[in-house]
């Protein structure tokens, strides 16, 4: 995982401060306060892949 | 490296009691959820219990066979975590698993430690 | 409770050969966005490693022979082509509320 200032998350996760590496977007279900859940209301969600 | 170094265990009779302990190293503990997952032959992996976070006054959660017999604490400041059994039975026999999750998954687990409960 | 059906409950497969394995909810764990299902592999005498969160995204290091897909109430684990350290046993894991619960698991081995 990338440091800040480097390369992006990739698509459906976002950096946190907190833990120093990218963390999923789809755990800001059952942790919305997360550092990282601001990151990932700004992009759209990963597409399932069917 | 992440490292779930788990201790306790063993022998121990019918309404007993039994303290699991797992030291944590490698990640930022206090922002993890800690969780005891058993296996065994008769129910396969079963969770049964979790503790949260310090900023919520460590709510936990328990599966309904060990409520009120099991008890789940931590303390951050050494970053381990407790599992407290009371009141022991033969089917809670089996092999107990310290495990670490943010929220969802379960990315890592401790070597495992068995209880046996019999006389 | 949500319960999870694995299917097979074992498996045989030649070497090189495609593994599928099935995990069936009782309700559904997705949301429009994501699906909140995760699979382990276990070989005797260790815990259980975690290979694939979300149905379909895999854990860092794991090969790129497992994948995941699925949604709702049906999800799939696929390894292709199975190699020989693949013989274990492969759990699905649900996080859609508590108590999180797990299938009963897949015994893989080799022809």
């Known amino acids: 995982e990338q440091a800040p200032g480097t390369a992006p998350c990739s698509r459906g996760s976002s950096w946190s401060a907190d833990l120093d590496k990218c963390m999923d977007c789809a755990s800001c279900r059952a942790r919305p306060h997360a550092d990282f859940c601001l990151g990932c209301a700004a992009a759209p969600p990963a597409p399932f892949r069917l | 490296e992440v490292k779930l170094q788990q201790s306790g265990g063993g022998l121990v009779q019918p309404g007993g009691s039994m303290k699991l302990s797992c030291v944590a190293s490698?990640?930022?503990?206090?922002?993890?959820?800690m969780n005891w997952v058993r296996q065994s032959p008769e129910q396969g992996l079963e969770w049964i219990a979790e503790i949260r976070l310090q900023s919520n006054d460590y709510p936990t959660h328990y599966a309904e066979s060990v409520k009120g017999r099991f008890t789940i604490s931590r303390d951050d400041s050494k970053n381990s975590v407790y599992l407290q059994m009371n009141n022991l039975r033969p089917e809670d026999t089996g092999i107990y698993y310290c495990?670490?999750?943010?929220?969802?998954?379960?990315?890592?687990w401790g070597q495992g430690t068995t209880l046996t409960v019999s006389s | 409770d949500t319960v999870l059906t694995q299917s097979p409950a074992s498996l045989v497969v030649s070497l090189g050969q495609r593994a599928t394995i099935s995990c069936r909810a009782s309700?559904?764990?997705?949301?429009?966005?994501?699906?909140?299902i995760h699979w382990y592999q276990q070989k005797p005498g260790q815990p259980p490693k975690f290979l694939i969160k979300y149905a379909s995204n895999r854990d860092s290091g794991v090969p790129a022979r497992f994948s995941g897909s699925g949604s709702g109430t049906d999800f799939t684990l696929n390894i292709h082509p199975v190699e020989e350290d693949d013989t274990a046993i492969y759990y699905c894991?649900?996080?859609?509320?508590?108590?999180?619960?797990f299938g009963a698991g897949t015994k893989l081995e080799l022809q």
């Open positions: 490698g990640f930022t503990f206090s922002y993890y959820w």
């Open positions: 309700q559904s764990v997705s949301t429009s966005d994501y699906s909140y």
């Open positions: 894991q649900h996080s859609w509320e508590i108590p999180p619960t």
């Open positions: 495990a670490c999750r943010y929220a969802d998954y379960f990315d890592h």
